[in-house]
Amino acid sequence: QRLPRMQEDSPLGGGSSGEDDPLGEEDLPSEEDSPREEDPPGEEDLPGEEDLPGEEDLPEVKPKSEEEGSLKLEDLPTVEAPGDPQEPQNNAHRDKEGDDQSHWRYGGDPPWPRVSPACAGRFQSPVDIRPQLAAFCPALRPLELLGFQLPPLPELRLRNNGHSVQLTLPPGLEMALGPGREYRALQLHLHWGAAGRPGSEHTVEGHRFPAEIHVVHLSTAFARVDEALGRPGGLAVLAAFLEEGPEENSAYEQLLSRLEEIAEEGSETQVPGLDISALLPSDFSRYFQYEGSLTTPPCAQGVIWTVFNQTVMLSAKQLHTLSDTLWGPGDSRLQLNFRATQPLNGRVIEASFPAGVDSSPRAAEPVQLNSCLAAGD
């Protein structure tokens, strides 16, 4: 186990896991709304308001290289940004019948910890990634993916499950985080915002990206998800940020072009198999890694998160299609389906590359670098 083993908490109520409420613009809280007491930012989260720049203080960020066509996270300006002003507590909903995690939604009642107590745990996801504070771990080797290039047949299920669009993956997609850390891919899904509003789950220095892809994996040490939940390293998620670029992304178009068929909550369609690895960044060697949780109920902890440093580019039209096609519960648009960032509570994010060195305009400032925890791995 590369990351420190973090014991599953037995939280005593309280503790909110705020998600963004996908309300109409007119329902959004005003900027002066006070933060919710149940969800105080961790020390590593938001700074005092006097330190916050306005939007105009953020320099424009250009991709590092023309041929790569995608932004590198360490190229982002090192600025402290507030959480989105529209981040009230995100709650889950259960039908009268359901005393389980099978029925929940973004926004509404009751709070997620009442649906699943683990949602109030101390080591939750997503988190804000601060490259300057990440621990460089040379032991973190390039990710290995095998069998991700699927033939057109058999087809795969693409489903609108009411809180995301999910592609169910067949057996045989193998992924290794390193020697002896082997997984098989189960499904992938996306998180997004709304028109003019970004919707990634993880953030970088407070910067939220337009969207985020998650590929969920089960450790080969476990037979089933139910048995892996809450076990350190039982599940692993590969995450990548989606950004706006000048060209259409042909890999994503194979999925986005089918969204109209599954606009209704609970609907599904079959799509030809595709190259799943083409939905991810090309650079498997540069990434951030930490131990967190599922970002939706049951919020089980022990999940190994690997967040790519390189982003994936989609056209503006594609990002609009993603955020403006699907419908969720209660005749509401399926938008802003992301959870608010959660406090690190002492966790250290590791980087497979020296992310905190010469990577931003503020690199000259004295920074307390964390040490790598993967020694001897």
Partner: antibody, heavy 126, light 111 residues
Framework: EVQLVESGGGLVQPGGSLRLSCAAS????????LIWVRQAPGKGLEWVSI???????YYADSVKGRFTISRDNAKNSLYLQMNSLRAEDTAVYYC????????????????????WGQGTLVTVSS | DIQMTQSPSSLSASVGDRVTITCQAS??????LSWYQQKPGKAPKLLIY???KLASGVPSRFSGSGSGTDFTLTISSLQCEDAATYYC?????????????FGGGTKVEIK
Amino acid sequence: EVQLVESGGGLVQPGGSLRLSCAASGFSLSRYTLIWVRQAPGKGLEWVSIIDSSSSAYYADSVKGRFTISRDNAKNSLYLQMNSLRAEDTAVYYCARDRVLSYDDYGDLPDGFDPWGQGTLVTVSS
Amino acid sequence: DIQMTQSPSSLSASVGDRVTITCQASQSISNYLSWYQQKPGKAPKLLIYAASKLASGVPSRFSGSGSGTDFTLTISSLQCEDAATYYCLGVYSISTDDGAAFGGGTKVEIK
């Protein structure tokens, strides 16, 4: 005790309909993937239909368009509506449950079914 | 569609013998394979899940192995009560029609 009990079988004419029920006790079936399996007299087991915990339903080619699997979580029951019945549908029909809670939102697949019901005989004959 | 090819279709062995039954999937199913024992007039009983894990209450003389497309059920020392028909079930997908299939069965008789 965790148990599944099928009912609803009987004699029906070709082209007729029948609805099988599978009542669960000792557990709530709402979070499980469930399956119908049949066995023609003297033959092997044949997968008929499956329903995941999101109530998405799938079928064997031999019954697609004629059979419908459904569940009623409030009644803790699984159903198989069989229409346009043929002589070759004559079999003992079993329901069975995925051995652990299903997380189909996470792409979970069943790797074994337990428990099974005792079976109910469907005879299609004129 | 997935197909499961099971062999042999029948076998006869003596008490104490080691018995091996194989199952081959038409495409990789990782370890989503289970083995069942069925006696006449009874419902199937789960023996092995996830290709190699012993179900609760099943004697340790039963074991399973394999991954991908080739799987084996072994009875290390055949007992009288093991006379039954054995089936494998492979699951490739539950999100497509015909994503699961049983093998044709192996009838085990005691000499």
